[in-house]
């Protein structure tokens, strides 16, 4: 005749796909010290065990290597360890202690294991800031993964120049040497749990610090269309009295500080405008000459100059004599 005992703890446990769970089981205190038998965990309904310490009994194909009976009769332990949880593990389980020498066995109550979709996602950590041209180590980690599970497979996707660094069961390191053009591009860490056939990923946008590479001046003359200067220009003819708006813009991350100087400034010169915009409401002789826009950045500066050449209005010139 079968003797029954109650599994301690909750009637159901939840585990996420690909992860691990321990189904607790303690042998009944009434079990005689002389009782010698084998332990078997069964999925409710199926008569092939999912885990056992009986060398003559083979377990289910689906659970082989993933389900383990943690058998320690002296400590009354009969717990079931499940790793690489799969959707099909979602079921009720019970434990049976059977002896080939005793007339009776022990059967536990049922416990349900609920396998949920994996909601955890990998973490990507970046030490400090990413600087153009400087290698940095990025770490993709899955701290919620159990050590005894099948190690996950890490894969990285990025347009930036990279090389793989060391990895552990729970993390992978990627060395990245970003370029200015890699700023705002995506970097993805994908983690696959081969034991359960589940893949999770996290994508971040790279924030790459880089000095300005390009500085340009847009020129607005009265109501006429703007034109852009991308390199130092020897001279730009402007009509006397005309309103001129010079707009400087530069790349760089974080954005460079833009300022305007008249002439070719020394490092500590005082700017005539502390923004990228220089308004010249009426061009006259005072404005003839060079104007320089400087893009200042912690990682380096860049500047561009243009030379204004003033055309005098004929009547204005005659009236002045």
């Amino acid at each position: 005749q079968e003797r029954r005992f109650q599994l301690e703890g909750p009637e159901s446990l939840t585990v996420q796909e690909g992860l691990c769970v321990l189904v607790p089981c303690r042998l009944p205190t009434t079990l005689p010290a002389s009782y010698y038998g084998y332990g078997y965990w069964f999925l409710e309904g199926a008569d092939v065990p999912v885990a056992t310490n009986d060398p003559d009994e083979e377990v289910q194909e689906e659970t082989r290597g993933r389900f383990h009976l943690l058998w320690d009769p002296r400590r009354k332990n009969c717990s079931l360890s499940i790793r690489d949880a799969r959707r099909r593990d979602n079921a009720a389980y019970f434990f049976r202690l059977k002896s080939k020498w005793m007339k009776y066995g022990y059967t536990s109550s049922k416990l349900s294991v609920r396998v949920m979709a994996l909601t955890h996602r990998p973490n990507i950590s970046i030490p400090g800031t990413l600087e153009s041209g400087h290698p940095s180590n990025l770490t993709c980690s899955v701290p919620w993964v159990c050590e005894q599970g099948t190690p996950p497979i890490f894969s990285w996707m990025s347009a930036a120049p990279t090389s793989l660094g060391p990895r552990t069961t729970q993390s992978s390191v990627l060395t990245i040497t970003p370029r200015p053009q890699d700023h705002s591009t995506n970097l993805t860490c994908q983690v696959t749990f081969p034991g359960a056939g589940v893949t999770m990923e996290r994508t971040i946008q790279l924030n790459v610090s880089y000095a300005p590479q390009k500085v340009a001046i847009s020129i607005f003359q009265g109501n006429s269309a703007a034109f852009k200067i991308l390199q130092n220009t020897s001279s730009l003819p402007v009509l006397e009295g005309q309103a001129l708006r010079l707009l400087c813009d530069a790349d760089g991350n974080p954005p460079a500080h833009l300022s305007w100087f008249q002439g070719f400034p020394a490092l500590n010169a005082t700017p005539i405008s502390n923004t990228g915009v220089l308004e010249l409401p009426q061009v006259g002789s005072a404005e003839e000459g060079d104007f320089t826009c400087r893009a200042q950045h912690p990682l380096g500066s860049l500047q561009i100059s243009l030379s204004l050449f003033v055309h005098w209005k004929p009547e204005g010139r005659a009236g002045g004599v």
Epitope: Q1, E44, G45, D47, V48, E57
Partner: antibody, heavy 121, light 106 residues
């Protein structure tokens, strides 16, 4: 839908051997042992034994040890039973059956349609 | 091994009549299961865990009992109920069956 499809009727001579099959479908073959049950004409049912499809491990009713041999082909989800040294006592319908094994009880939940064995000279 | 004794071996009942058949066990078991078998077909699980009806089994069937005495009851006999009913235990190995009760329609 769970199905157990058994091979057709057999007419064999005394002393000979016979091998019958049971093809399973509609469930994971390796999750359940395959059981065999004998029903002599107009008589009750007797459990012969079972086989674990994962390793071919068998368990027999003492009465049928030496008479029946259970084997399995995992790749085709088919179980076999060979009966040897046949006598008229072995004339019967033989069923393969799947067992429901629960924490509180155990019974046969699915049966094959049966293979009729007639031993006659 | 555990011996199951079914009685009566054969019985007949008229439509609408209440039918009870019993299964006595040589030593106490936790549960009893019943199978229905009609001529030329394989047994069908009919009642399991002593009192639970298998799917598709009419509600006029019921099962009860404990220990060494179990029974199957039909509250109101119908023609389609004519069959042989076997009790079965699996509280200990090997699993054993009763010799069956053949129920005929009067």
């Amino acid at each position: 839908e769970v199905q157990l499809q058994q091979s057709g009727p057999e007419l064999v001579k005394p002393g000979a051997s016979v091998k019958m099959s049971c093809k399973a479908s509609g469930y994971t073959f390796t999750d359940y042992k395959m059981h065999w049950v004998k029903q002599s004409h107009g008589k009750s049912l007797e459990w012969i034994g079972n086989i674990n499809p994962n390793n071919g491990g068998t368990s027999y009713n003492q009465k049928f040890k030496g008479k029946a041999t259970l084997t399995v082909n995992k790749s085709s989800s088919t179980a076999y039973m060979e009966l040897r040294s046949l006598t008229s006592e072995d004339s019967a319908v033989y069923y393969c059956a799947r067992r429901y094994y629960g924490s509180s009880s155990s019974y046969f939940d699915y049966w094959g349609q049966g293979t009729t064995l007639t031993v006659s000279s | 091994q555990i011996v199951l004794t079914q009685s009566p071996a054969i019985m007949s009942a008229s439509p609408g009549e209440k039918v009870t058949m019993t299964c006595s066990v040589s030593s106490s078991v936790s549960y009893m299961h019943w199978y229905q078998q009609k001529s030329g077909t394989s047994p069908k699980r009919w009642i399991y865990d002593t009192s639970k009806l298998a799917s598709g089994v009419p509600a006029r069937f019921s099962g009860s009992g404990s220990g060494t005495s179990y029974s199957l009851t039909i509250s109101s006999m119908e023609a389609e109920d004519a069959a042989t009913y076997y009790c079965q235990q699996w509280s200990s190995n090997p699993p054993t069956f009763g010799a069956g009760t053949k129920l005929e329609l009067k």
